[in-house]
């Protein structure tokens, strides 16, 4: 049939909860292409009816929820004007009781469910939530050994759990929980994460480089909306936290009530030698109190700020 076959690594998935897989294979999917999902080499495509438990949502296949019988090989066919690629994804559904303390780790879990914290450092865990835009995700709750995590060493930031001054006691079984809403129905997503610790620097002691900002000022009119990207390059193996702070406080915490200034979701692009990270800060409405205040982008030990300033008066207008 002229399609190139591409085999993805196996995915281990938890039963009875939502799961989605995006059929992306850059640069194939960056142009004008059609994407169709199939199960177990069936000639009949996966349904696109949003009420179906399993359906295609744009380039995604969405299970609401995943069930035992859903294990198998799924294919997505990407057809371009002059090309065809068939991507094979092997999905294995398992039953995992996250509070079963007799199970010491899960060796077959996908890598994103095994994470490492660095002793004595400020580090973070990530709740990997890959779902299409049609899925609305609520706030994330974090658990360790089935108890909700509390304490001043822990901060929830977007999809991350920040852990300050990591200790040996921080190793063990974690879970992040979120309520997903799709077409008015609610589903629970509970991702178990086995967390191990290391003393190793992990990234060879290299320092992340902040490409932008450069301790610079930005001219911005009062009352306007402003979005500023912080661009960072870092080694692929880094465990650095990336965030925006003001007055040495996370912006999301500092503006917790008004939510007028917020940190965006971190994205990254992977290059051969390094990752390029972007995390933005959004000012919904610039106020007088924002001028002259350093808004700091932090990445590990690196930091750089932007400072807002009023534009110089334009005398030509008079």
């Amino acid at each position: 049939d002229g399609c190139n076959d591409i085999f993805m690594k196996n995915e281990m998935l938890s039963a009875s909860q939502p799961f989605a897989f995006n059929c992306t294979f850059p640069p194939i999917t960056s142009g004008e292409v059609s994407v169709t999902w199939y199960k177990n080499s069936s000639k009949i495509p996966v349904s696109k009816i949003i009420q179906s438990r399993i359906h295609q949502d744009e380039t995604w296949i969405l299970f609401l929820p995943m069930e035992w019988g859903d294990s198998g090989v799924y294919q997505c066919v990407i057809k371009g004007r002059d090309s065809c690629h068939r991507i094979h994804v092997n999905l294995t559904v398992f039953e995992k009781q996250w509070c079963d303390t007799s199970v010491k780790g899960l060796p077959n879990l996908s890598d994103e469910y095994k994470q490492i914290l660095h002793l004595g450092k400020d580090d973070s865990l990530t709740c990997h939530l890959h779902f299409p835009k049609s899925c609305i995700l609520g706030p994330i709750k974090w658990y360790k050994d089935c108890n909700e995590i509390t304490g001043e060493r822990f901060t929830v930031l977007e999809t991350r759990l920040l852990v300050s001054n990591v200790s040996a006691e921080d190793r063990g079984n974690y879970a992040c929980q979120v309520i997903l809403t799709h077409s008015g129905k609610q589903y629970e997503v509970l991702n178990g994460i086995t967390v191990s610790i290391t003393e190793r620097a992990g990234y060879g002691g290299s320092v992340p480089k902040i490409i932008y900002p450069k301790n610079n000022s930005i001219e911005v009119q009062l009352g306007t909306t402003l979005i500023v990207d912080c661009n960072i390059t870092d080694t692929k193996d880094n465990t650095n936290l990336r965030c925006w702070r003001v007055n040495n406080t996370l912006v999301d915490d500092y503006y917790n009530e008004s939510k007028r200034i917020r940190e965006g979701v971190e994205t990254h692009a992977s290059f051969r030698e390094y990752n390029l990270y972007t995390v933005n800060i959004t000012f919904l409405e610039v106020k007088m109190e924002d001028y002259g205040l350093p808004f700091m982008c932090h990445a590990g030990v690196s930091a750089a700020y932007i400072m807002l300033q009023l534009p110089a008066p334009d005398f030509r207008a008079y």
Partner: antibody
Framework: QVQLQESGPGLVKPSQTLSLTCTVS??????GYWNWIRNHPGKGLEYI?????????YYNPSLKSRVTISRDTSKNQYYLKLSSVTAADTAVYYC??????????????WGQGTLVTVSS | DIQMTQSPSSLSASVGDRVTITCRAS?????MYWYQQKPGKAPKLWIY???NLASGVPSRFSGSGSGTSYTLTISSLQPEDFATYYC?????????FGQGTKLEIK
Amino acid sequence: QVQLQESGPGLVKPSQTLSLTCTVSGASITSGYWNWIRNHPGKGLEYIGYISYSGYTYYNPSLKSRVTISRDTSKNQYYLKLSSVTAADTAVYYCATGGYDYVEDALYYWGQGTLVTVSS
Amino acid sequence: DIQMTQSPSSLSASVGDRVTITCRASSNVRYMYWYQQKPGKAPKLWIYLTSNLASGVPSRFSGSGSGTSYTLTISSLQPEDFATYYCQQFTTSPYTFGQGTKLEIK
């Protein structure tokens, strides 16, 4: 159960390159840290280096100019190359990994070791 | 580099003896790891995170210490304990082992 197995030639000529393979079963080398350690005859253990889950490599500075650790995730194998060997590189070479009780540095799983002799 | 100095280098002792092996680091380390090695065999993880016994290690073994001084203690030596013991640190690269302590039957 995690198992590691070293393989490679037992005899290498001086000035040549020593090449060893560690084949891993029961775990994926895309998680954790994968180490090489050697034991000189009648002497102690020497840490050579590691390759991490992401492919990052660390080498002991005393060997850095001569050592390369690499991997093939499709085969679940990782490798040691040591160039310009001399008789001082004669040792039993071990591959090992941690993760015991969620501690990556607790090297719980070891290969059986392979003796490499450098001699003409 | 952090130098790890074990003492004694070798030790003759009798079954039932209490034995202490010391590992001194040239700079502070956060945790110590101990390995047991018998002739012709791979090392075995014995003690991790300074004081935790690995699976299968008898309770007569214990580990303690902090900063630059760490000890492995055997409360009552048994025939199967005769081996070489190594300490190791992962706090600062290069990750170094002690030179080993050979425990022999008197």
